[in-house]
């Protein structure tokens, strides 16, 4: 009788799930660059803002063609994870000024936990790697004043918008390879 | 549709070897990561080994690492599972997965018996 | 003895609602890994019915649905019907083997 019938597709191939990805992290590209846009217009920034616990940049435009999967996919989890660890802070610890970025500063955490489930999800169909998230940092400690709030925002934000467009770029030059 | 259809099982003494096969169709075979998951009588399910969708990465379980290759062949889209030195305790349905896994065959018989 | 732990058995009447949890570590669940559901019916292979923590797949009823909190995960069955009666299986990926660890499996019956 031959082997009986397989089951029907449940869910999408690898590389759908990649192109689905790529659009919820170009989705997520646009909400920060709308909210860095927002941030700036209520409160001006004088100059560049960093945060030393957030993560450097993790690679060039340049750099992109050398680029592995596993090591894109693992770089870009890490990142990520950190940049919800921060808004998560700026949410809780932020203060009463940045209260005027709500809801959306919630809709980007949701957004964000959903693209981090998503890039695990495409590496466990892929069977890639997926070493354990780095063990959590000590926790932030609060700003030291209103303005402190303000530009560790910024900083979070421009951070963020900086990650993101590069892991576009890296996601759809991984794209041609799988 | 997906399917996976697993062949190489059967009786093999103590010591001996085999090698199974898994044969898929109806998806990306290339696209996927695979796996091997094997299912002793009347026990649950335990992970077996697992290669990345191009084959780089290949992992095992303790209870079978340097006994047990996993390989692949994307241009035939046929999943294998070399199985030497094989012990009473590796008897089991072992099934060929892929994805998370997402899709299972109906698995393949292995019995270890003198 | 299975990293995620299943109980052993679940029971429940038609109609009810039945949940089935599954506790794993700060190694694999509370590190952040997702979890998935595999239902086996009797002398079947097993069969997604969740992933990624809540997700289901296409043709899997919304009957089912699954949650994760901290180490541990849930599997809830509403409306319980004769035909879910089988074993339920998590499963979620453990770094230190790069591969996915099973729990032990719940055998559900419907009374």
């Known amino acids: 009788p031959g082997p009986p019938p397989g089951p029907p597709r449940v869910s999408p191939d690898p590389r759908a799930e990649l192109d689905s990805t790529v659009l919820l992290t170009r989705s997520l590209l646009a909400d920060t660059r709308q909210l860095a846009a927002q941030l700036r217009d209520k409160f001006p920034a004088d100059g560049d803002h960093n945060l030393d616990s957030l993560p450097t940049l993790a690679m060039s435009a340049g750099a992109l063609g050398a680029l592995q999967l596993p090591g894109v996919l693992t770089r870009l989890r890490a990142d990520l994870l950190s940049y919800l660890r921060h808004v998560q802070w700026l949410r809780r610890a932020g203060g009463s000024s940045l209260k005027t970025l709500e809801p959306e500063l919630g809709t980007l955490q949701a957004r964000l936990d959903r693209l981090l489930r998503r890039l695990q999800l495409l590496m466990s169909r892929l069977a890639l790697p997926q070493p354990p998230p780095d063990p959590p940092a000590p926790p932030l400690a609060p700003p030291s004043s209103a303005w402190g709030g303000i530009r560790a925002a910024h900083a979070i934000l421009g951070g963020l918008h900086l990650t993101l467009d590069w892991a576009v770029r890296g996601l759809l030059l991984l794209k041609t390879r799988l | 549709e997906v399917q996976l259809l697993e062949s190489g099982g059967g009786l093999v003494q103590p010591g001996g070897s085999l090698r199974l096969s898994c044969a898929a169709s109806?998806?990306?075979?290339?696209?996927?990561?695979m796996h091997w998951v094997r299912q002793a009588p009347g026990k649950g399910l335990e992970w077996v080994s697992v290669?990345?969708?191009?084959?780089?990465?290949?992992y095992y379980a303790d209870s079978v690492k340097g006994r047990f290759t996993i390989s692949r062949d994307n241009s035939k889209n046929t999943l294998y599972l070399q199985m030497n030195s094989l012990r009473a305790e590796d008897t089991a349905v072992y099934y060929c997965?892929?994805?998370?896994?997402?899709?299972w065959g109906q698995g393949t018989l292995v019995t270890v018996s003198s | 003895q299975s990293v995620l732990t299943q109980p052993p058995s679940a029971s429940g009447t038609p109609g009810q609602r039945v949940t089935i949890s599954c506790t794993g570590s700060?190694?694999?669940?509370?590190?952040?890994?997702?979890v998935h559901w595999y239902q086996q019916l009797p002398g079947t292979a097993p069969k997604l019915l969740i992933y990624?923590?809540?997700e289901r797949p296409s043709g899997v009823p919304d009957r089912f649905s699954g949650s994760k909190s901290g180490t541990s995960a849930s599997l809830a069955i509403s409306g319980l019907r004769s035909e879910d009666e089988a074993d339920y299986y998590c499963?979620?990926?453990?770094?230190?083997?790069?591969?996915?660890?099973f729990g032990g499996g719940t055998k559900l019956t419907v009374l």
């Open positions: 997965a892929a994805g998370v896994p997402d899709y």
């Open positions: 109806g998806f990306t075979f290339s696209s996927y990561g």
């Open positions: 290669i990345s969708y191009d084959g780089s990465y290949k």
């Open positions: 700060s190694s694999n669940i509370g590190a952040g890994y997702d």
């Open positions: 990624s923590n809540n």
């Open positions: 499963a979620a990926w453990d770094p230190s083997l790069n591969g996915p660890v």
